[in-house]
Every structure is written in C-alpha cells, then in structure tokens.
Amino acid sequence: LEVQVPEDPVVALVGTDATLCCSFSPEPGFSLAQLNLIWQLTDTKQLVHSFAEGQDQGSAYANRTALFPDLLAQGNASLRLQRVRVADEGSFTCFVSIRDFGSAAVSLQVAAPYSKPSMTLEPNKDLRPGDTVTITCSSYQGYPEAEVFWQDGQGVPLTGNVTTSQMANEQGLFDVHSILRVVLGANGTYSCLVRNPVLQQDAHSSVTITPQRSPTGAVEVQVPEDPVVALVGTDATLRCSFSPEPGFSLAQLNLIWQLTDTKQLVHSFTEGRDQGSAYANRTALFPDLLAQGNASLRLQRVRVADEGSFTCFVSIRDFGSAAVSLQVAAPYSKPSMTLEPNKDLRPGDTVTITCSSYRGYPEAEVFWQDGQGVPLTGNVTTSQMANEQGLFDVHSVLRVVLGANGTYSCLVRNPVLQQDAHGSVTITGQPMTFPPEA
C-alpha cells in the first residue's frame, strides 16, 4: 500500500491548527470497516490518533487531534492538530493497514513570529558624544531561536561588543535580548534585526540617539510606529512606554488603554492599583514593569474583531498619549485542488480546477500559473467568505482547455504575513482519473 506524505516539513504557527497530510490509494470495493489507521510519534511511538473497526477511536494526544471522517473513504488519512505548541514539533508517522499496509513519516516544524523589537538605552538621559551607551534590543515570544543582526544608520554591520541571550519560557517560546555597547558620536542610528530562520520573517527596530534629551519630568509616551501583527488565537503585546520622572511612584500613575475610535475603555491603572480589564477579561498590564515606565498591554487570545487602533494615555503630573495599531492575521491552509470532471480526461476537454484554502485573515491574494510559471489570468473566479470568527475561506476556480499534459498551480498569499500557500495539479495526456488511482 502506498502511503504518501509531503516531503517538506509542515510549518505551523504556534496557536494555530496544522494539517499533517497523509493519503493512500484505496483498492476497489474498499470500505471503512476494513481500515486501520494509526498516527503516532515517530521516535517514541506514542499513539496520537487512530481509526479502527470502522470507527474513529479519537485522540490520544491531549484531545487536540482530529481526522477528516468524510474524506477517509477517498484515501485521505490526514490529521488535524489543533492549537499547535512548540512541544508538538517533530516527526509523526501515518500507518495505514487495510489488507496491504504501509507507513510514512511527516515532519512538523513549529514556528512563532518574533515581536517588533523594543529598544532601551542605558543611560537614557543627558547623553553626550563620547559617552558609552548600552542599547538593548528585546523581541519576544518567537520560535525557533532567532538570528540577531545589528547595523548602523548607513547599513554597516556592527558585530563587536554584541551579547545576545535567548531564554525559552514555559511554552518553549524564546525571548531574545541582544545588547550592543557603543561609544556615541555626535548622533547616530542603531538598528537591530531579529530574524526567524524558519518563517524567514524579519522584525526590526532602530533608535536614533541625539545628545540632547527631553527635559527630566516630561512624559513622552512612545509606541511602535508599525502595526503590531498578531496571529488569531495567540497573545499580542501592545507596547507603550513613558519616561518616569525622578521620585515617580505608581501611586501617581494614571494609565488608560482604550479603543482609539470609540473611546471604549480597555484597561486602566489608577489610584495605585490595576483596575483590571474592561475588555472581555482578555487584557493585562505588566505590573512589575510599570514603575520603569512600561505601560504595555497584553491582549490574550486575539480575535479578528480586535483589529484596530488602541490608545495608551498616561497621566502623572504631565500627560501624553499615543495610538498603536493592531493588525490581526491568520495563515491560510495549504490549498486543496479538485477537478470537475475528474475522470477519463482527454486533451481538448474543458476542465474546472478549484483551489480552496481555509481560515485565513485578512483576505487573500490568489494567483494561478502553468507549469512554466506563466500567469493564468483569464477565466478565473475567486470568492472569499468570512466565517463567524471573521476568518476567510477562499475558493478560486480556473476553467482551462486541457493540452497534451499540463501542470496548474494555485498560490494563496496572505498579504500581511507575506505567507504563500501553494497547491498544484498535473494532468497528463493519456486518459486519466483524478486523484490518480494506484
């Protein structure tokens, strides 16, 4: 029995769902009563999920796995793994036994994008040319370990006097802290780039240091210029910082987070106390960091509806506010391809190829091309429907007249994550059926 899995690792983002594809070619007259299917961890042989005696035996893996019962009879033994964690990374074996049997292993590569780095200076006041300053670049909750690069305003790499540490939290996600020690010139820009090697995602920040600083005591509220990109289901940190005056105490602090447009209260700190979340109990401050001027807000289990602008308002003796944008995103699933008609295809036949990709956000861009990479733009109809959570299912239909043979590829791009998901189908000249039989 030929059991087929993807050669390349399946890359899944922490907190999202992943599909571990596995297919077999059912013999004529096959019924599910004959199927025995086992998913297990390749190394430890720990049972993950099974199907036997005509029944789904359920998940043996923290109740986070599911088969596709409607597709099993067609030979689709794929496994859905929900709310992916770092600990899930590794090899999964799909074992199929009917009369014949076979197995194949698929690798799951887990990834999490790093947050936009925050930059801090020490010392951060009364800086003059010639002073030695320590610049710390911190980026959070990424996986796997990052590559960190520093450069100056002219793009010249800075490699000396750099110390980078990466610490994994309980979930296995890494917080990266990279420290650069420099002697200040008249002024200068220092950039830090944190790269996720799996996602090929770069997160950067820079700090420009000029000798004069704002006068002691003034409140400068600072938020990232770029939108914070957060994946649906994960946690996001809306960064906000202020410069506490000397002798500042939390009893003097009044902090309000609210939705910029509607002014709806999200979270507040006043009268020396965290007043708690006014936003579906999904927000939290960083109480241990407030006294240092860190007024950042943690938003848990991000939803599509959270997208928008949040204002951080700080009032001590002086006051100030700034707005930070939250851009929500969800990766699109690997497209599934279907043909209509899908039997006895011959050159000259008109065939409808449907490319479907699921549960992404925001709306996708869809591109078709032939085997030579030439774009196919005519006779394409694409529809995108949002579900209750606001996530989009994309269905793109291409109508083509078959040549002697041909490959048709569909690419579904998430414009925010710059994530491409592709599917392709190859149709050969001789009469054929799709999917191919054994």
């Epitope: 704002s214 006068p215 002691t216 005591g217 003034a218 409140v219 400068e220 509220v221 005056e245 009893a251 003097q252 009044n254 309000i256 609210q258 002014k263 709806q264 209260l265 507040s268 006043t270 009268e271 007043q275 006014a278 204002t311 308002f313 009032s315 001590i316 003796r317 002086d318 006051f319 100030g320 506010s321 700034a322």
Partner: antibody, heavy 118, light 110 residues
Framework: EVQLLESGGGLVQPGGSLRLSCAAS????????MHWVRQAPGKGLEWVSA????????YYADSVKGRFTISRDNSKNTLYLQMNSLRAEDTAVYYC???????????WGQGTLVTVSS | QSVLTQPPSASGTPGQRVTISCSGG????????VNWYQQLPGTAPKLLIY???KRPSGVPDRFSGSKSGTSASLAISGLRSEDEADYYC???????????FGGGTKLTVL
C-alpha cells in the same frame, strides 16, 4: 514663586479670532501638562483643552474641537490658545492651569475675559 | 449639562459638618480619581483635594474627600464663614478623552 499669567482676552465679533497667551514662571515649564479652563459669566467651570509637556499630545473638548488650537513654546515658557470661528457661547473667563497628579490642576492663573458679541 | 452631577447648593451653620456629593459614571469617576476645587467669590479656583482624598499642603484637615463606585463626596467639618464658596468636582473621562467638571455647588454658611 509659581505663577501663571494670562493675556490676550478682549472683545471680538462672532466669527472672529483671538489668541490667548499664558506666561509661566517659577517652575520647569516643559515638564508639566497644561490646560485651558473657562467659566462663562455666572456659570460653572468647563475644561477646554490640554497639551502635554513636550507638546506632542493635545486634547480638546467637543465644544471647541476644530475651532481652537492649543500650543506651547517651551523655550519661552508660554502656553497659547488660538481661538477661531468664535461664537457668543465662547464668552467666558479663560484660565490657564498647570496639570497635576491624578488628572488634577494645582496652579491657576487669574484668568482673562473673552467677550464675543456684535 | 455637566458630565458630573453636583447639587447646585448646600448650606450649614458655623461648626457644623456638610457634605457635597458628585455623581458620575463608569468612564469617569468609576475608573478614575476625583479632584475637588474651591472658588471663593471673585477669585480663581484653588485645588482643595486631589486623588480622591489627598490634601495639598496648606489645605486644612477640616476638608476631606472620599470615593465609592461612581460617586465621590467632599466633607467639610467645623464649618467657618470663610468656607462660603463654590465647590467643583473634577475627573478624567476616558470615553471623552478629556477632563470633566461637575456643575458646581454653592455653599452658604448661615
């Protein structure tokens, strides 16, 4: 001694403009948020506008939004309120105040009278 | 119409204790501190109580403030004739992104 001294008030016709100034002394001006508060004759206090110590953040009451502009010159220790498209209901004594902890206002000027009338 | 509601007037005799109330909502008093001001006739207002109950230096301890839920109150004990003035409560309103005052209470010492 900490002092705030308003100037620039006077009589102006409806639709006209006026610029109020507030000279601050006795404290580090750039480290305090500043406000304008007004009081119509025989009425209560009404907050008008506020500006942060650096001048980077500004706030306005709905009643003046789009017509009034608050600004400051930290090198001159001076707060300003540019009032355009003035209406009769803008007639009031305008106070310049210094921001304080807990959203308070701990120092007030003596006020300057703005009369909008034809 | 003020965002914060105060009684227009209050009165008391010398030596008595009087209380002035200030009522608001969840976006102002309910989630932010309250300040109180005294305005003597013909003068600029003066900060009397800040942060619900704190007194600036120079303010006698006869003046006290408190807050509960979406309401606040100012208490003046041992009333004196020089306490005759207008009293205003004030807070920050997060839904308006602005500072707000009560309509003021005129206190008469009989």
């Amino acid at each position: 001694e900490v002092q705030l001294l308003e100037s620039g008030g006077g009589l102006v016709q409806p639709g006209g403009s006026l610029r109020l100034s507030c000279a601050a002394s006795g404290f580090t001006f750039s480290t305090y948020g500043m406000h304008w508060v007004r009081q119509a004759p025989g009425k209560g206090l009404e907050w008008v506008s506020a500006i942060s110590g650096s001048g980077g953040s500004t706030y306005y009451a709905d009643s003046v939004k789009g017509r009034f502009t608050i600004s400051r010159d930290n090198s001159k220790n001076t707060l300003y309120l540019q009032m355009n498209s003035l209406r009769a209901e803008d007639t009031a004594v305008y106070y310049c105040t210094r921001g304080y902890y807990y959203y308070g206002m701990d120092v007030w000027g003596q006020g300057t009278l703005v009369t909008v009338s034809s | 119409q003020s965002v914060l509601t105060q009684p227009p007037s209050a009165s008391g005799t010398p030596g008595q204790r009087v209380t002035i109330s200030c009522s608001g909502g969840s976006s102002n008093i309910g989630s932010n501190p309250v300040n109180w001001y005294q305005q003597l006739p013909g003068t600029a207002p003066k900060l009397l109580i800040y942060g619900n109950s704190k007194r600036p230096s120079g303010v006698p301890d006869r003046f006290s403030g408190s807050k509960s839920g979406t309401s606040a109150s100012l208490a003046i004990s041992g009333l004196r004739s020089e306490d005759e003035a207008d009293y205003y409560c004030q807070s920050y309103d997060s839904s308006l992104s602005g500072w707000v005052f009560g309509g003021g209470t005129k206190l008469t010492v009989l």
